[in-house]
Interface confidence: low
């Protein structure tokens, strides 16, 4: 197909465009056409600009001519000058490039002349009659800035189609002037439109960042997502990050908030900063810097040991006075030689008995000054209804010192597919002080219910960790905390947490933590029934140190912040020392994360193209007063360039037609 019968085409650089219009026009018509589009007839003043014109025009047919913006009035010959007396339609004669086809003629230049460029060969300049209609014309458009052509995306149905401010539609652009529109058609049938706009930080750029064809799904470029790409129902995609990572500001890449090791001991993704720091058992966050950990002096906690306590970094030990020996719980003391089982078996009674050493509850709060405490003890929870309760404890016997944990049936807990969790905390980070009361089990303040919130990103239903919830009245029963009843056998029913060994208090939730899929529990457990708990009491989950001596506080109210489970040893070690180091696996208090309905990550809104319209006010290089091509005036004195800013003011046609009729020479290209 003859390219000259085709559509106009353009070549753009960062500051200007040349456009070729293959339309038969006179010089005046061509000039008007360029002005109406906001440009001018082409003024290739430099070799670089000439190269761009060359590349645009290409190798056209041999006889074809294109008007450019050079015009000379009658009798204005200046043959010694580079432009030979011709003036650019922008009003000046500045040039660093000429490409005349013929040497200058020495004639008197009686008629107005205009310059056309040969479409073939070396694109030489020919002068000729301005009234002659040639095969086309070249326009030039200047502008403040340009946007680079869009990179093709794999999801595109074809190349981007650009519409310039001068109404040229093409796919073949390297640069797009300010005000251009890019239309991208996607294979999914949808499309995207972008505008080349001024950017707030200066310069120009596209109104929207890619990828544009998200509707084509997640391939072949994973939707631009670093981790997971999810195809939504409406055809667009959203990016998600694997657990332990968060979506970056670009909505596509993922970042690991703990990668920079912001915490001294343990880091967990989540929280307002993107991560939260936790301290191991026996440590608490430093008051001046929550990223650091300082040793907790557990011995300052009333009743932590029945008799004597020695604190050390990361833990503590209980001791007994002469004639007494430490019981298996590591806390209580009994007369040397006496069997310790009785004291422990009487725990239920002691919990509910009135103690002799009463301590004002407010004083206890003040004394502990809000410090974090990782204490063994009893975790009180606010109930939604009065629970039954059974203590998961079996008396110790010399031949078998190991308390056992109930063995779940093969179908319980249900199997989970375990995602990799890069950071998990094995701490119970207590953010409220221990409440000590010798007279009754202390209930949490109504204003401060002890909830255990999940601070890590919500998991899918398949990957959720069970709940020890304080206030979840609306949760379906499957997600409510299970309470062990006095009348239940040792085999726990589905959806209830198994009993917890008081000596090895690792918590085995009803839905086993996906972080540790290989954990195994063996053995059976008998229960020691406690006396009935009054209906206003909260459900009790026993953990380490549940066998409290008579002088011990009734309960420890814990408010936790760390929510993930510690690594649970498959084979539980025997306790061979009286050491009460909370760091030892046998003395870790483990709290499962709250099970919450899976919350989908916030989806990125599908960006619609910017709806603003940008007024196009191209600035032209060498923008002296725009010149209107004039045809021959009545006398040389009047054949001057008259600046006129109004592009609509058409030049007057003065008798050139008559001249042309009488002068064969004027109609020929020299």
């Amino acid at each position: 197909q003859d390219p000259w019968a085709a559509e106009p085409r353009a070549a753009c650089g960062p500051s200007s465009c040349y456009a070729l219009f293959p339309r038969r026009r006179t010089f005046l018509e061509a000039w008007r056409a360029c002005r109406e589009l906001g440009g001018d007839l082409a003024t290739p003043r430099t070799p670089e600009e000439a190269q761009r014109v060359d590349s645009l025009v290409g190798a056209g047919p041999a006889s074809r001519l294109l008007w450019i913006g050079l015009q000379r009035q009658a009798r204005q010959c200046q043959l010694q000058r580079p432009l030979r007396g011709f003036t650019w339609t922008t009003g000046d004669q500045d040039t660093a490039f000429t490409n005349w086809a013929q040497p200058a003629s020495g004639g008197p230049c009686p008629a107005q002349r205009c310059v056309a460029l040969e479409a073939s060969g070396e694109h030489r300049w020919l002068e000729g009659s301005c009234t002659l209609a040639v095969d086309g014309y070249l326009c030039q458009f200047g502008f403040e800035g340009a946007c680079p052509a869009l990179q093709d995306e794999a999801g595109q149905a074809g190349p981007a189609v650009y519409t310039t401010p001068f109404h040229l539609v093409s796919t073949e652009f390297e640069w797009l002037p300010f005000g251009s529109v890019a239309a991208v058609q996607c294979q999914a049938g949808r499309g995207a439109s972008l505008l080349c706009v001024k950017q707030p930080e200066g310069g120009v750029g596209w109104s929207r960042a890619g990828p544009l064809c998200l509707g084509t799904g997640c391939s072949p470029d994973n939707g631009g997502c670093e981790h997971e790409c999810v195809e939504e129902v409406d055809g667009h995609v959203s990016c998600r990050c694997t657990e332990g990572f968060r979506l970056a500001a670009d909505g596509r890449s993922c970042e690991d908030p703990c990668a920079q090791a912001p915490c001294e001991q343990q880091c967990e993704p989540g929280g307002p900063q993107g991560y939260s720091c936790h301290c191991r058992l026996g440590f608490r966050p430093a008051e001046d810097d929550p990223h650091r950990c300082v040793d907790t002096d557990e011995c300052q906690i009333a009743g932590v040991c029945q008799q004597m306590c020695v604190n050390y970094v990361g833990g503590f030990e209980c001791y007994c006075s002469e004639g007494h020996e430490l019981e298996a719980d590591g806390i209580s003391c009994s007369p040397a030689g006496a069997m310790g089982a009785q004291a422990s078996q009487d725990l239920g009674d002691e919990l509910l008995d009135d103690g002799e050493d009463e301590e004002d509850e407010d004083e206890a709060w003040k004394a502990f000054n809000g410090g974090w405490t990782e204490m063994p003890g009893i975790l009180w929870m606010e109930p939604t209804q009065p629970p039954d309760f059974a203590l998961a404890y079996r008396p110790s016997f010399p031949e078998d010192r190991e308390p056992q944990i109930p063995y779940p049936e093969p179908t319980w807990p249900p199997p989970l597919s375990a995602p990799r969790v890069p950071y998990h905390s094995s701490v119970l980070s207590v953010t409220r002080p221990v409440v000590v009361s010798a007279t009754h089990p202390t209930l949490p303040s109504a204003h401060q219910p002890p909830v255990i919130p999940a601070t890590h990103p919500a998991l899918s239903r398949d990957h959720q960790i069970p709940v020890i919830a304080a206030n979840y009245p609306d949760l379906p029963s499957a997600y409510q905390p299970g309470i062990l009843s006095v009348s239940h056998s040792a085999q726990p029913p589905a959806h209830q947490p198994p009993m917890i060994s008081t000596k090895y208090p690792e918590l085995f939730p009803a839905h086993q933590s996906p972080m540790f899929p290989d954990t195994r529990v063996a053995g059976t457990q008998t229960t020691t029934h406690l006396p009935g708990i009054p209906p206003n009491h909260a459900p009790l989950v026993t953990t380490l140190g549940a066998q409290l001596p008579p002088q011990a506080p009734d309960a420890l109210v814990l408010r936790t912040q760390a929510t993930q489970l510690p690594i649970i040893p498959t084979a539980q070690p025997s306790l061979t020392t009286t050491s009460r180091s909370p760091v030892s696996p046998a003395h870790q208090i483990s709290v499962p994360a709250a099970t919450q309905p899976a919350a989908l990550p916030t989806l990125l809104p599908s960006q619609s193209p910017t709806n603003q319209t940008s007024p196009i006010s191209p600035t032209h290089p060498h923008s002296k007063a725009p010149q209107i091509p004039r045809e021959d005036g009545p006398s040389p004195k009047l054949a001057l360039w008259l600046p006129s800013p109004a592009p609509t003011a058409a030049p007057t046609a003065l008798g050139e037609a008559g001249l042309a009729e009488h002068s064969q020479r004027d109609d020929r290209w020299l």
Epitope: Q151, D152, E153, A154, Q156, Q187, A188, T216, G217, C218, S219, P220, D221, N222, G223, E226, C229, V230, E231
Partner: antibody
Framework: EVQLVESGGGLVQPGRSMKLSCSAS????????MAWVRQAPTKGLEWVAS????????YYRDSVKGRFTISRDTAESTLYLQMDSLKSEDTATYYC?????????WGQGVKVTVSS | DIVLTQSPTTLSVTPGETVSLSCRAS??????LHWYQQKTNESPRLLIK???QSNSGIPSRFSASGSGTDFTLNIKDVEFDDVSSYFC?????????FGSGTKLEIK
């Protein structure tokens, strides 16, 4: 564990047809683009075709367009490549791959020999 | 089509050396460039995705960099187990294309 197992290869005469299957397990098949990549003996890897998650969008290399058809059965978690009008230059080991853009899981490959 | 040119075709190194494999694209592929390792008689294995992101389970000895049209795969402290062919692949535009591969040998 993600597994892709190809089947259906063998010896076939030029101009004849053959259908390859790829059974997928260990991931949610419907959520992923899938692709076929081939490797001629002692040669490099060559992408053949890809299919969108629903099987509605399909993409082919020019040399197989009109002759090969990629399809998927979401219910069966199976990917197919129907190869018609086979040519000797189609001789290769054909791999089924999960296409996240990059190919993150590959099958063990199935050999297709086109020869008279 | 985007053509990916890999060099060298074959690379012979001694264990413990660090090597660089090059992949050059005929057009810009942005960051949509990936690297695969293929051992003899095995399926390819994804090493690096999106220019420099290591796939899970890949030793940290493997790293990659580059942008636009020039990309490099680096292998530190080469081991006998690294003897393989290494291919780059682009997912910038259809058709998806692979480089012709670089074969790594141990002296």
């Amino acid at each position: 564990e993600v597994q892709l197992v190809e089947s259906g290869g063998g010896l076939v005469q030029p101009g004849r047809s053959m259908k390859l299957s790829c059974s997928a397990s260990g991931f949610i098949f419907r959520n992923y683009y899938m692709a076929w990549v081939r490797q001629a003996p002692t040669k490099g890897l060559e992408w053949v075709a890809s299919t969108g998650t629903g099987g509605d969008f399909t993409y082919y290399r020019d040399s197989v367009k009109g002759r090969f058809t990629i399809s998927r059965d979401t219910a069966e978690s199976t990917l197919y490549l129907q190869m018609d009008s086979l040519k000797s230059e189609d001789t290769a080991t054909y791999y089924c791959a999960r296409a996240y853009g990059y190919f993150d899981y590959w099958g063990q490959g199935v050999k297709v020999t086109v020869s008279s | 089509d985007i053509v990916l040119t890999q060099s060298p075709t074959t690379l012979s190194v001694t264990p413990g050396e660090t090597v660089s494999l090059s992949c050059r694209a005929s057009h810009s592929v942005g960051t949509n460039l990936h690297w695969y390792q293929q051992k003899t008689n095995e399926s390819p294995r994804l090493l690096i995705k999106y220019v420099s992101q290591s796939n899970s389970g890949i030793p940290s000895r493997f790293s990659a960099s580059g942008s636009g049209t020039d990309f490099t795969l680096n292998i530190k402290d080469v081991e006998f187990d690294d003897v393989s062919s290494y291919f780059c692949q682009q997912t910038q535009s259809w058709p998806l294309t692979f480089g012709s591969g670089t074969k790594l040998e141990i002296k």
